[in-house]
């Protein structure tokens, strides 16, 4: 069972001093987000017993394995059901405490009732403040039964539940009709899933015979020991004031466990600590009684004395629960109450015994749960004891359960049962997860879900190149940390598998499923530099770069050009997908913008070092287009152009540029400057006769503007072939701007 205890402080004179504490003795309990242990939860459960809302209760965590609930302001805050939840996974367990108001009309004679399947349970509510009206019994908040007030027997209302079954478990209450629910007597009924002394599916297995009021768990056959007792069968008493499965916890305060109610996992329920009794656990046991709720009687023989915490204290020469066994009777010594082995191991189990006559090898035997008897293979004889060693055949899961070491001599016999837990080594159900990769390393999360039993003591990561027959490389890692596999080959697939181990010999599980993880390409190492750049328009930039010469093939797939517009906080990226390219035209840029420019080589997804940056200023965009361009032939070699100035000019025009092209011709156009910006007409001379020409023009301020519409016009016929078109007021060699 899970080592979980819910303590209620029952010193009820002041509700504000009342507290509930949940203590877990489980390894790693309460660490919260830790994958190996969910947190302890402690809360009031208002589903069945609803109380008026009050200020919220305060929850305080004390270390990783303890949580305390305080902040009760009035007695009614205390009434009802509280629960603590602890343990991980399939071991998650809820411990329940039911609190009754000491001033209620009806009080339970006993709050927790643990009964076996098929038993008759009797709940008894004692009249504390009489009302001459019906008593309503409820089960888990729903109507269950009615008693007339005349039906009280010796001042008690009894509810008989014959032939109880596990679904009958729950919270029962007895309430007078018309009375406040807070005046009810609240009970908790726990019905074990099996008949007395049985456990397991089908209730076929025999309980170990729990001592000192321990209760056999119907699922796993373990004894849930009362507070203050320990051992597989609760055979050992803790020191006064201690509790927990290994007596590892100490009761708070100077008066030890006085005034504390202890609630343990079902099917135990709640009781006072060892040595105490009464509704508030403040009364010491009467002489001759001991244990939780003082339910046990000593009946010591042979001069033994009764200790209210531990039972009979035997004089020299006697032992046994009632000091009924002479020390001459053989006795099993120091047998561990619980042993754990891994599946398919062949452990050695030792069993020591003393007595008179002295036990010999053949007088000590080991009995497995299936009844098989093992004889010892060797014995070590010492003056005060004989230790028999048993070689156990390969363990199977069915070997889990209660084993027994038995010694028999002519002086009598003794036996000691102990629990053997056969654990299944853990096997990963999934492959490890790749977190990040580089060219020579992989970062892997090895923590995966697994079948079998924890805790995980070590994690081994096995890896080797895919399709390789070489030996696996192995790295041993901490279960909760990510692993970096180093010194790998770039651009290589690796098969990676996890192997988990649990403590103990043979705790290594089978390897988990493989997964393929591929290292990245090698990083490109060459740093380009920018050779130059020039503006090809207000929004176009041609860039060229170089790489250092190195021997061997170039490691790279292409280049990445980056333009950073600091004013707008925008980055433009241009991918050049050939590693041989050394120039690129960047278009669609923003005129008048200051850019920072660099280039870097890339390989796969990895970027090499960036070139030293260059700073480039694109000219601002030019003025709008001239309007209403018109062409008129004047002669066989002259055409006059007329236009209107552009509208909404951002500044004074410095010149116009006219583009002249023969219609349908394949040659490049000619550009002619008109340097007098105030003009709205010009004559283009030196044209060929009978030839159709296309004209368009644009203005320039700091940069060239937009082109106007294109116009067509033909020169007149019969002229001589001209040398080429010129503008009226300039010589041709001055005006041409190819």
């Amino acid at each position: 069972a899970v080592d979980l205890t819910l303590l209620a402080n029952l010193r009820l004179t002041d509700p504000q001093r009342f507290f509930l504490t949940c203590v877990s003795g489980e390894a790693g309990a309460g660490r919260g987000s830790d994958a190996w242990g969910p947190p302890l939860l402690l809360e009031k459960d208002d589903r069945i017993v609803r109380t008026p809302p009050g200020p919220p209760l305060r929850l305080a965590r004390n270390g990783s394995h303890q949580v305390t609930l305080r902040g009760f302001s009035k007695p009614s805050d205390l009434v009802g059901v509280f629960s603590c939840v602890g343990g991980a996974g399939a071991r998650r367990t809820r411990v329940i405490y039911v609190h009754n108001s000491p001033g209620a009309h009806l009080l339970p004679d006993k709050v927790t009732h643990t009964v076996n399947k098929g038993d008759t349970a009797v709940l008894s509510a004692r009249v504390h403040k009489e009302k001459q009206t019906d008593v309503i019994w409820k089960s888990n908040g729903s109507y269950f039964y009615t008693l007339d007030w005349h039906e009280a027997q010796d001042g008690r209302f009894l509810l008989q539940l014959p032939n109880v079954q596990p679904p009958s478990s729950g919270i029962y209450s007895a309430t007078y009709l018309e009375a406040s629910p807070l005046g009810s007597a609240f009970f908790r009924l726990i019905v074990r899933g099996c008949g007395a002394g049985r456990w397991g599916p089908g209730c076929t297995k025999e309980c170990p015979g729990c001592l000192h009021g321990g209760v056999c768990h119907d699922h796993d056959g373990e004894c849930v020991c009362p507070p203050g007792f320990t051992g597989t069968r609760c055979e050992q008493a803790c020191r006064e004031g201690r509790f927990g499965q290994s007596c590892q916890e100490q009761c708070p305060g100077i008066s030890g466990c006085r005034g504390l109610t202890f609630c343990l996992p079902d099917p135990y329920g709640c009781s006072c600590g060892s040595g105490w009794r009464g509704s508030q656990c403040q009364e010491a046991c009467a002489p001759g009684h001991f244990g939780a709720d003082c339910r046990l009687q000593c009946q010591c023989q042979n001069g033994g004395t009764c200790d209210r915490f531990s039972g009979c204290v035997c004089p020299s020469g006697w032992h046994g629960v009632h000091c009924e066994k002479s020390d001459r009777i053989p006795q099993i010594l120091n047998m561990a109450s619980e042993l754990e082995f891994n599946l398919e191991t062949m452990p050695r189990i030792n069993c020591a015994a003393a007595g008179n006559p002295f036990p010999v090898r053949g007088s000590i035997e080991l009995r497995k749960p299936d009844g098989t008897v093992l004889l010892s293979t060797k014995a070590i004889v010492e003056p005060e004891k004989t230790t028999a060693e048993f070689e156990v055949p390969r363990l199977v899961l069915a070997d889990s359960g209660f084993w027994e070491c038995r010694v028999s001599t002519s002086g009598g016999q003794d036996s000691r049962r102990f629990k053997v837990n056969v654990k299944v080594p853990p096997v990963p159900l999934a492959a490890p997860r790749l977190l990040t990769k580089q060219s020579r390393q992989l970062v892997v999360s090895p923590l995966v879900s697994f079948s079998g039993d924890g805790p995980i003591s070590t994690v081994r990561l096995h890896y080797r190149p895919q399709d390789s027959t070489m030996d696996w490389s192995t790295i041993v890692v901490d279960p909760s940390e990510n692993v970096t596999l180093m010194n790998l080959r770039p651009k290589t697939g690796y098969s990676v598998r996890v192997q988990l181990s649990r403590p103990g010999e043979g705790g290594e599980g089978a390897w988990g499923p493989p997964t393929l993880m591929t290292t990245d390409c090698p990083e490109p190492l060459l740093q380009p530099w920018l050779e130059g750049w020039h503006v090809e328009g207000t929004d176009r930039l041609r860039v060229s770069w170089s790489l250092p010469l190195v021997p061997g093939p170039l490691v790279g797939d292409g280049f990445l050009l980056r333009l950073w517009d600091g004013t707008r906080g925008q980055e433009r990226r241009e991918n050049v997908s050939s590693p041989q390219a050394r120039t690129a035209l960047l278009t669609g840029l923003t005129p008048g913008t200051h850019y920072q420019l660099d280039v870097q080589l890339y390989h796969c997804t990895l970027l090499g070092p960036a070139s030293p940056p260059a700073h480039v200023l694109l000219p601002p965009s030019g003025p709008p287009a001239p309007r209403h361009l018109h062409a008129q032939a004047l002669s066989d070699s002259e055409i006059q152009l007329t236009w209107k100035h552009p509208e909404a000019l951002p500044g004074p025009i410095s010149k116009y540029v006219v583009e002249v092209q023969v219609a349908g011709g394949a040659g490049d156009p000619l550009w002619i400057d008109v340097d007098r910006p105030e003009e709205t007409s010009t004559i283009i001379r030196g044209l060929n006769a009978s030839t159709r020409y296309l004209f368009r023009m644009r203005a320039s301020i700091q940069g060239l503007g937009d082109w106007s519409n294109t116009v067509e016009e033909s020169t007149l016929g019969n002229g001589l072939q001209a040398e080429g078109p010129v503008q009226e007021s300039r010589a041709a060699e001055e005006g041409l701007d190819q």
Epitope: D134, I136, Y143, F144, Y145, T146, L147, D148, H150, E151, T175, L177, E178
Partner: antibody
Framework: EVQLLESGGGLVQPGGSLRLSCAAS????????MNWVRQAPGKGLEWVSV????????YYADSVKGRFTISRDNSKNTLYLQMNSLRAEDTAMYYC???????????????WGQGTLVTVSS | QSALTQPASVSGSPGQSITISCTGT?????????VSWYQQHPGKAPKLMIS???NRPSGVSNRFSGSKSGNTASLTISGLQAEDEADYYC???????????FGTGTKVTVL
């Protein structure tokens, strides 16, 4: 589904006896208080008697006290009303009714049978 | 224990609201919140309509509502419908040895 079925009614002479039965099904009969309620022809409802789940407590209307006896057999899920020294004014439809409880635990008659007619006449 | 007092009859037109009163003593209606109301159509068994003064069981129309003031409990039927025509009885838990007492009954007629 909760069902209550009365039987045993009929014509009886004044001073005679009759035993009514009520067979219950669809609920845990042994956990509930059970009642007999009667209604004379053209008149209102009159509560007659109640018996507690264990059978350990019974109560009667003044008009029938000493003449009628309510009982139950929890093993047979059956409620009974033994009527002795019958009078003409006992002529009525006799209903058996279960006491149920609301969320605030008030007792009321939540399920009724269809009734059995008792006629006391010479 | 005498019966609780109810009006012999109450009538109303469809869609109207009507209220039936039920007057008792401090030993019954006034002493407990345990008043219930039953509807009975001719030739049929009574049916629980209201419990605990104002608690409507599932399946009962929300046109039926109950209340209590002092020694008098009331049943209100709003939006009266033809199928509401029936006899209505109140009942109370009582402190006397009779435990339960019914009202004299009210015949509701839908005009």
């Amino acid at each position: 589904e909760v069902q209550l079925l009365e039987s045993g009614g009929g014509l009886v002479q004044p001073g005679g006896s009759l035993r009514l039965s009520c067979a219950a099904s669809g609920f845990t009969f042994s956990n509930y208080k059970m009642n007999w309620v009667r209604q004379a022809p053209g008149k209102g409802l009159e509560w007659v008697s109640v018996i507690y789940p264990s059978g350990g407590a019974t109560y009667y209307a003044d008009s029938v006290k000493g003449r009628f006896t309510i009982s139950r057999d929890n093993s047979k899920n059956t409620l009974y009303l033994q009527m002795n020294s019958l009078r003409a004014e006992d002529t009525a439809m006799y209903y058996c009714a279960r006491v149920g409880y609301s969320s605030s635990w008030d007792p009321h008659f939540d399920y009724w049978g269809q009734g059995t007619l008792v006629t006391v006449s010479s | 224990q005498s019966a609780l007092t109810q009006p012999a009859s109450v009538s109303g037109s469809p869609g109207q609201s009507i209220t039936i009163s039920c007057t008792g003593t401090s030993s019954d209606v006034g002493g407990y919140n345990y008043v219930s109301w039953y509807q009975q159509h001719p030739g049929k068994a009574p049916k629980l309509m209201i419990s605990d003064v104002s608690n409507r069981p599932s399946g009962v129309s929300n046109r039926f509502s109950g209340s209590k003031s002092g020694n008098t409990a009331s049943l209100t039927i709003s939006g009266l419908q033809a199928e509401d025509e029936a006899d209505y009885y109140c009942s109370s838990y009582t402190s006397s040895s009779t435990l339960y007492v019914f009202g004299t009954g009210t015949k509701v007629t839908v005009l």
